[in-house]
């Protein structure tokens, strides 16, 4: 992990207007482990689409298929969870769309439709036809995995029939679910075969089993609830940026750092420098200089422009972004060639992003 001796002090000082950053919460796509997931990049007129996960370039492999504007993940695992982005490169500009993928056996988006149609789930039988419990509406039970934002209402349903009319009880993680097990308790609507929990919190995560039984038998069905926590996150940088670059002595060059942050980000451009002829301080850490940072007197902090470069400008340039939650950094190298050599844009290489979980 990088540690630095700063030639100039750095602080958490985000002062740039937020309009340049995607502040809104990204859309969440939910999958259970083992399921396949397909997401379409919601950008128009894309000549070339590139994909990233948690700021790192995403390429095809035996489980990840990239076809046109579609991303397919086969046999999803929890490790596939994260912040994804597709970037559409056009002749004049580029645009990025972000979305979250949540793969967990604790996942959901609660069945919040009103129970206006619930009465028909309560099936009355001819008193002579004794029958063990059975499910009357399996369609309403297909979605076993529910990922629900904290503070939302969750409803689980187990519409059943039988003769005599079965009773229903609920278990949480295999044990009797009691009212005192959660703040605010819960509601059971026997007429609608439903369990309702309002204002869910992270401690509500777990397996919920309805047990439907009469004297002729018992059936059960288990739902898994994940409470998706809402909290701001640290910045994420677009993969491949800044990109390595080369230019001749006297030439100009630009480094670009694209930032995703839902809390105001502070951008710094930092370079390794020498102090008293040494690149490292007495503590063995490299000397760094802040070349540019976001603030009132700084125009577009996402771009570092270098003019009339000299050989001394060659080296590693770090884009470091922080908000009050955390940090991210990626770097690129500048190669300065003698005047007679023609410059060429190098292949974009992402510095290994040590800030990712």
């Amino acid at each position: 992990r990088p540690s630095f001796s700063l030639v100039e002090d750095t602080t958490l000082e985000p002062e740039e207007p937020p309009t340049k950053y995607q502040i809104s919460q990204p859309e969440v796509y939910v999958a259970a482990p083992g399921e396949s997931l397909e997401v379409r990049c919601l950008l128009k007129d894309a000549a070339v689409i590139s994909w990233t996960k948690d700021g790192v370039h995403l390429g095809p492999n035996n489980r990840t298929v990239l076809i046109g504007e579609y991303l397919q993940i086969k046999g999803a695992t929890p490790r596939d969870s994260g912040l994804y982005a597709c970037t559409a490169s056009r002749t004049v500009d580029s645009e990025t769309w972000y979305f979250m993928v949540n793969v967990t056996d604790a996942i959901s988006s609660g069945d919040d439709e009103d129970d206006t149609d619930g009465a028909e789930d309560f099936v009355s039988e001819n008193s002579n036809n004794k029958r063990a419990p059975y499910w009357t509406n399996t369609e309403k039970m297909e979605k076993r995995l529910h990922a629900v934002p904290a503070a939302n209402t969750v409803k689980f349903r187990c519409p059943a029939g039988g003769n005599p009319m079965p009773t229903m009880r609920w278990l949480k993680n295999g044990k009797e679910f009691k009212q005192e097990h959660r703040i605010g308790g819960y509601k059971v609507r026997n007429q609608h075969w439903s369990l309702i929990m309002e204002s869910v919190v992270p401690s509500d995560k777990g397996n919920y089993t309805c047990v439907v039984e009469n004297e002729y038998g018992s059936i059960n069905h288990t739902y898994h609830l994940d409470v998706v926590e809402r909290s701001p996150h640290r910045p994420i940088l677009q993969a491949g940026l800044p990109a390595n670059a080369s230019t001749v002595v006297g030439g100009d060059v630009e480094f670009v750092c694209k930032v995703y942050s839902d809390a105001q980000p502070h951008i710094q451009w930092i370079k390794h420098v020498e102090k008293n002829g040494s690149k490292y301080g007495p503590d063995g850490l490299p000397y760094l200089k802040v070349l540019k940072h976001s603030g009132i007197n700084s125009s577009n902090a996402e771009v570092l422009a270098l003019f009339n470069v000299t050989e001394a400008d060659a080296g590693e340039y770090i884009c470091k972004v922080s908000n009050y939650i955390g940090q991210a950094n990626q770097s690129a190298w500048l190669t300065v060639l003698p005047k007679q050599q023609a410059p060429g844009r190098e292949k974009e290489i992402t510095a290994s992003p040590d800030y990712l979980e």
Epitope: E13, E15, I325, G326
Partner: antibody, heavy 113, light 107 residues
Framework: QVQLVQSGAEVKKPGASVKVSCKAS????????IHWVRQAPGQGLEWMGA????????SYNQRFKVRATLTADTSTSTVYMELSSLRSEDTAVYYC??????WGQGTTVTVSS | DIQMTQSPSSLSASVGDRVTITCRAS??????LNWYQQKPGKAPKLLIY???NLADGVPSRFSGSGSGTDFTLTISSLQPEDFATYYC?????????FGGGTKVEIK
């Protein structure tokens, strides 16, 4: 789940130093700033500073820059806040917080001769 | 430093009331504002981040609005557990200053 557990109450004499610890668990320690906020009796909240455990970056409220020192030990997922040259007006509850989202239980520091 | 001014400093209300607390920043902080609830002897609890986003586990009766310099925390229907002190905080630039607090008491 995310937890921040702070060290116990301290009673100090004016001029002394105090070192309060904040042990984090339930998340990747290096990925979030730990902030320190204090609250004098019957008063409001005051931000003191923050540290990023991944690289030790610190940021201080100018009011505390001379007297406060924040450090992080990644091997134990613990952050420390040391306040020197204590005076009676430093009597307060000191909180650590992960990015202001999760808070420790608070440590009462009493400065009295 | 950015100054945060809360008003009122205290208010009395009844269960079921709609309560509004305002916070003004001394300069533009865009949407970089958090709201907290604090009960006696307890740590503050994050209610709203980014001026309008409800934090984890916070009931939907709480809402935040505003940007720039003027912000509002609204409790649509006050519940018994909502009697507490509320603070706003600038999270745009250091020092991350807090408002003076608004104490919500039972009428």
């Amino acid at each position: 789940q995310v937890q921040l557990v702070q060290s116990g109450a301290e009673v100090k004499k004016p001029g002394a130093s105090v070192k309060v610890s904040c042990k984090a668990s339930g998340y990747t320690f290096t990925n979030y700033y730990i902030h320190w906020v204090r609250q004098a009796p019957g008063q409001g909240l005051e931000w003191m500073g923050a540290i990023y455990p991944d690289n030790g970056d610190t940021s201080y409220n100018q009011r505390f820059k001379v007297r406060a020192t924040l450090t992080a030990d990644t091997s134990t997922s613990t952050v420390y806040m040391e306040l020197s040259s204590l005076r009676s007006e430093d009597t307060a509850v000191y909180y650590c917080a992960r990015a202001f989202t999760y808070w420790g239980q608070g440590t009462t520091v009493t400065v009295s001769s | 430093d950015i100054q945060m001014t809360q008003s009122p400093s205290s208010l009395s209300a009844s269960v079921g009331d709609r309560v509004t607390i305002t916070c003004r920043a001394s300069e533009n902080i865009y949407g970089a504002l958090n709201w907290y609830q604090q009960k006696p002897g307890k740590a503050p609890k994050l209610l709203i981040y980014g001026a309008t986003n409800l934090a984890d586990g916070v009931p939907s009766r709480f809402s935040g609005s505003g940007s720039g310099t003027d912000f509002t925390l609204t409790i649509s229907s006050l519940q018994p557990e909502d009697f507490a002190t509320y603070y706003c905080q600038n999270v745009l630039s250091t020092p991350y200053t807090f408002g003076g607090g608004t104490k919500v008491e039972i009428k």
